[in-house]
């Protein structure tokens, strides 16, 4: 798995809805692949982490003043939806076909 | 200034172009306010950090398995442009009114 020493990348993160207390309203799936963005944003920032100009600037300032300014952070830059079957207020199962922003599609340095 | 103990917020970061070696092509300004996103993304994530569903999920998983999964990260979610006077390839001073993505407008948890 991608630790702090490795560069920013998408890693597996299986989320069980029971673990986060969402099983009270999400019937299915029981778990899903959320992914996680892990690793460092090191100089020089590679194209694959799609850095913004601000992230590039912050990385350069961090190089000069490492105690004063933090590195850019490895975060989701594009998310994907999943479909979920949930219980409404009356306990009736209903489908949300395009439940936005639940899974990481891409990671980057921001 | 916002430390690791405070919640995610926008803080001042004055960037001097000489410090980062960009004074070789940026004529003016000599420095500008880039801002920095600092602070933690703690449970529960407040509305003002505009969390994505994935950030909410990751925060809940981090609560349950703090050593396995990291917290969401405080990053720029909206950037602003600045105007710069720079030297083009032939050394001619050129004004760029909207040099995009140079300054933080908003921070959030991602």
């Amino acid at each position: 798995s991608a630790g702090a020493g490795s560069h920013c990348q998408k890693t597996s993160l299986r989320v069980n809805f029971e673990d986060i207390g969402w099983d009270s309203w999400i019937i299915a799936p029981k778990e899903y692949e959320a992914y996680e963005c892990k690793g460092g944003c090191f100089f020089p920032l590679a194209d694959d982490v799609t850095p913004t100009k601000h992230a590039i600037v912050q990385t350069l300032v961090h190089l000069k003043f490492p105690t004063k300014v933090g590195k850019a952070c490895c975060v989701p830059t594009k998310l994907s939806p999943i479909s979920v079957l949930y219980k409404d207020d009356m306990g009736v199962p209903t489908l949300k076909y395009h439940y936005e922003g639940m899974s990481v599609a891409e990671c980057g340095c921001r | 200034s916002a430390g690791a103990g405070s919640h995610c917020q926008k803080t001042s970061l004055r960037v001097n172009f000489e410090d980062i070696g960009w004074d070789s092509w940026i004529i003016a300004p000599k420095e500008y306010e880039a801002y920095e996103c600092k602070g933690g993304c703690f449970f529960p994530l407040a509305d003002d950090v505009t969390p994505t569903k994935h950030a909410i999920v990751q925060t809940l998983v981090h609560l349950k398995f703090p050593t396995k999964v990291g917290k969401a990260c405080c990053v720029p979610t909206k950037l602003s442009p600045i105007s710069v006077l720079y030297k083009d390839d032939m050394g001619v001073p050129t004004l760029k009114y909207h040099y995009e993505g140079m300054s933080v407008a908003e921070c959030g948890c991602r």
């Epitope: 799936p29 899903y32 079957l85 409404d88 207020d89 209903t94 489908l95 949300k96 | -």
Partner: antibody, heavy 114, light 110 residues
């Protein structure tokens, strides 16, 4: 008991308009994401579009063949879903179902013919 | 041409086990979100399976599975009342909604 009842189907000329309704009961309609799905005679199922709940921003999405011609709306006070169909074509002829994805109405037939 | 490919027909005799496949031919479709509907002659579709969830009233003779880029629906102990059209459905991320397979007409022989 969950019930979805469509109405408003019928015969319409090409280029014409029609408004379908779906009356919902037995569940919290205002929180549900509602879709229209159609089925041409002897053919398979085709998603038409969907409207999200107000808490999920109430946005609508449409399948490419109907985008710009069909409009989905809802009236949570009346537990009703609507499909406004304009510039109808022969290929829009189908049984139109309103659905939560888990529950479906019996469908209403729309025939586009001159 | 649907991006979810199903065989147009399948058949079996009473008591037999029949499997209907559904394969993904487009990267915008996530196999994770594939689920199944049954449409008896002259009636509206009915949800049979969503992930590992079988709605109440659906026989446990129906089971779903996924592997790689395909999903399948298995019907054991085939009965005459199982004669119907079966549709797989998935989430089309680009279209922001569900997409259906072409359907499989199941005939119970004898």
């Amino acid at each position: 008991e969950v019930q979805l009842v469509e109405s408003g189907g019928g015969l319409v000329q090409p280029g014409g308009s029609l408004r379908l309704s779906c009356a919902a009961s037995g569940f919290t309609f205002s929180n549900a994401w509602m879709s229209w799905v159609r089925q041409a005679p002897g053919k398979g199922l085709e998603w038409v579009g969907r409207i999200k709940s107000k808490t999920d921003s109430g946005t609508t999405d449409y399948a490419a063949p109907v985008k710009g011609r069909f409009t989905i709306s809802r009236d949570n006070a009346k537990n009703s879903l609507y499909l406004q169909m304009n510039s109808l074509r022969a290929e829009d002829t189908a049984v139109y179902y309103c659905t939560t994805g888990t529950y479906w109405g019996q469908g209403t037939l729309v025939t586009v013919s001159s | 041409q649907s991006v979810l490919t199903q065989p147009p027909s399948a058949s079996g005799t009473p008591g037999q086990r029949v499997t209907i496949s559904c394969s993904v031919t487009n990267s915008d479709i996530d196999i994770f979100n594939v689920h199944w509907y049954q449409q008896l002659p002259g009636t509206a579709p009915k949800l049979l399976f969503f992930h590992d969830y079988r709605p109440s009233g659906v026989s446990d003779r129906f089971s779903g599975s996924k592997s790689g880029t395909s999903a399948s629906l298995a019907i054991s102990g085939l009965r005459s009342e199982d004669e119907a059209d079966y549709y797989c459905a998935g989430l089309d991320v680009a279209m922001r909604g569900p997409v259906f397979g072409g359907g499989t007409k199941l005939t119970v022989l004898g």
